[in-house]
């Protein structure tokens, strides 16, 4: 069966939107008005993995681009990257673990925990126009809470 996907945008808990500022650069900044069109539309695929009521394994692809968020160990540190894939083979139900995030819903907010690196989360900085990254702390200065907005296909 084909993998189930939905299109959505994400904003962090400070209402910063995610935009592409270059081919491999995902940054978070406040947008308003017409500029909202710049925000990235994700194709969120529901993939194989450990699942519970509040934890759902997903892959985050960029709609109509052959790019996925992935988590790799780079120089001993878990690192978030945008990775090119062969569009003929993705998305798929059994995604490699580096592409899988546990979507965790808490108090109407979402966290995205790396399946490859437990307790490492998709994060944004308090500062404007900084890269989205993989952070190893929750509840600190960096932001790990997001809201999701559905986008019609």
């Amino acid at each position: 069966a084909p993998v189930r996907s939905l299109n959505c945008t994400l904003r962090d808990s400070q209402q910063k939107s995610l935009v592409m500022s270059g081919p491999y650069e995902l940054k978070a900044l406040h947008l308003q008005g017409q500029d909202m069109e710049q925000q990235v539309v994700f194709s969120m695929s529901f993939v194989q993995g450990e699942e519970s009521n509040d934890k759902i394994p997903v892959a985050l692809g960029l709609k109509e681009k052959n790019l996925y968020l992935s988590c790799v160990l780079k120089d001993d540190k878990p690192t978030l990257q945008l990775e090119s894939v062969d569009p003929k083979n993705y998305p798929k139900k059994k995604m490699e673990k580096r592409f899988v995030f546990n979507k965790i819903e808490i108090n109407n907010k979402l966290e995205f925990e790396s399946a490859q690196f437990p307790n490492w989360y998709i994060s944004t900085s308090q500062a404007e126009n900084m890269p989205v990254f993989l952070g190893g702390t929750k509840g600190g200065q960096d932001i790990t809470d997001f809201t999701m907005q559905f986008v019609s296909s």
Epitope: M20, S21, G22, P23, Y24, E25, K65, N66, L67, S70, V72, K74, D75, K77, T79, L80, Q81, L82, E83, S84, M130, P131, F133
Partner: antibody, heavy 116, light 112 residues
Framework: EVQLLESGGGLVQPGGSLRLSCAAS????????MSWVRQAPGKGLEWVSG????????GYADSVKGRFTISRDNSKNTLYLQMNSLRAEDTAVYYC?????????WGQGTLVTVSS | QTVVTQEPSFSVSPGGTVTLTCGLS?????????PGWYQQTPGQAPRTLIY???NRSSGVPDRFSGSILGNKAALTITGAQADDESDYYC????????????FGGGTKLTVL
Amino acid sequence: EVQLLESGGGLVQPGGSLRLSCAASGFTFSTYAMSWVRQAPGKGLEWVSGINTGGGSTGYADSVKGRFTISRDNSKNTLYLQMNSLRAEDTAVYYCAKDWMATTPWGQGTLVTVSS
Amino acid sequence: QTVVTQEPSFSVSPGGTVTLTCGLSSGSVTTNNYPGWYQQTPGQAPRTLIYNTNNRSSGVPDRFSGSILGNKAALTITGAQADDESDYYCALYMSSGSNNAVFGGGTKLTVL
């Protein structure tokens, strides 16, 4: 203050190899894609190569594909360009730059001269 | 192989407005090419003016603006000044197929 400092250039014979380094400071290196751009004497700019944050995706200009390899060490805040099978036409000042599409600031560059 | 095209030279009067363009030998430039504009004066390292179509780099005066005009990327300089006399390069990302970027040949801008 964001700073990029290129090193490793010099005189090399055709067919030889060089490894360029770029030491980055003043920003969180591991969260940025990086690139190399070169400029031959009296010529325009040429994008050479780019690498994403984790090193999983790279890109190369057609003129260097198969001869040059870009890499990075996020623990050392350093970008590299391994250049093999060098040709006279690779003679240029090599700049490293933040982001795939080279955003400010640029370093001062390192000169590579390929000559017998 | 796709070529990035720029006007070889352009002149503008002090205080005037000039628009430099950046096109593709085949096809149209879009925001998915992440157009960038770079200024270089002789003997100096390049300076990024505009990235991602229309984002000004820090410290760049708002006299410089980027846009898409028709099927090309454009750099507009309003209120041209003597020290704007430089070489201007654009660069375009060439899609995830080739996964590279290409600079145009540059435009030599004269302010007279």
